[in-house]
Amino acid sequence: HTAAQDNCTCPTNKMTVCSPDGPGGRCQCRALGSGMAVDCSTLTSKCLLLKARMSAPKNARTLVRPSEHALVDNDGLYDPDCDPEGRFKARQCNQTSVCWCVNSVGVRRTDKGDLSLRCDELVRTHHILIDLRHRPTAGAFNHSDLDAELRRLFRERYRLHPKFVAAVHYEQPTIQIELRQNTSQKAAGDVDIGDAAYYFERDIKGESLFQGRGGLDLRVRGEPLQVERTLIYYLDEIPPKFSMKRLTA
């Protein structure tokens, strides 16, 4: 079954409404905001999660603090348009008819325009670099232990196939996790690296998307790995198209 049967909840997505109205009285869960049915045995797409987050009552939503390190996803939260599979639509527009093109992780990759703006295809983000700084510890983590634990984390918690974790680099206190997934590599049923990175980002921020009030418990040989800052860089299969005006502003 696709959800925790006993109390009909979605283990992998707390931003859902679940009820035993599936086939044969099975537990079925729908994402808040979009009402789309979700598969609770795997991650929910980032697009549906953002939509659910924006639909939550304002007083229930955590305020997003603009970070001095927000180098890439500068636009922050928005209420996205998702396709029937839950992926981002290539063109996103706000209520004032300002439109822009996004990549597969929903990050803007063009200048903003009007309703005449065309986004011919959803460009895939095929390489994600997660740059972390951990809090001071008694000594450095053993690199091979750290590598193994982070790979296990992405495999077990985020259901990401190990072949998509390209590398784990470590120079105390900086950890870099490289995720790579070309269109040709991603098979049906594979978790998308963008979704895995988003779940990880929310876990690191203490805003876990998994069921319950608890958070991430990440340890390397028993020593807690606590992150004090995160930067995520996205590389697309086709380079973004920003005007020179934006680059010199």
Partner: nanobody, 123 residues
Framework: QVQLLESGGGLVQPGGSLRLSCLAS????????MGWFRQPPGKEREFVAT????????YYADFVKGRFTISRDNSKNTLYLQMNSLRAEDTAVYYC????????????????WGKGTLVTVSS
Amino acid sequence: QVQLLESGGGLVQPGGSLRLSCLASGRTVGRTAMGWFRQPPGKEREFVATISWAGGTTYYADFVKGRFTISRDNSKNTLYLQMNSLRAEDTAVYYCAASEPYSDYDPSGMVYWGKGTLVTVSS
């Protein structure tokens, strides 16, 4: 997906002891927080105790503190509940539960459940 199978329940006299076991199977059990819950006859299911995946942190309901001990053996994929000084009000079906991998020991994060084992405390 995690599968859980409880054992060790039975009839015991007041003041007696019992040890429950829960065998976990599935690809992720080594990194799941786990816990025990119980459902007394005619009542709601209630939290008993939880333990972190590394085993270093435990959390108990007030009514079992000092009497029950939760522990785990990750090499055997097994969770235990040692129950001492049992009382009639401890009579219940005891359920083993597990979290998603790498979740902490918060009881609200338990999403996978066993079928339960009945503990009856009676003279």
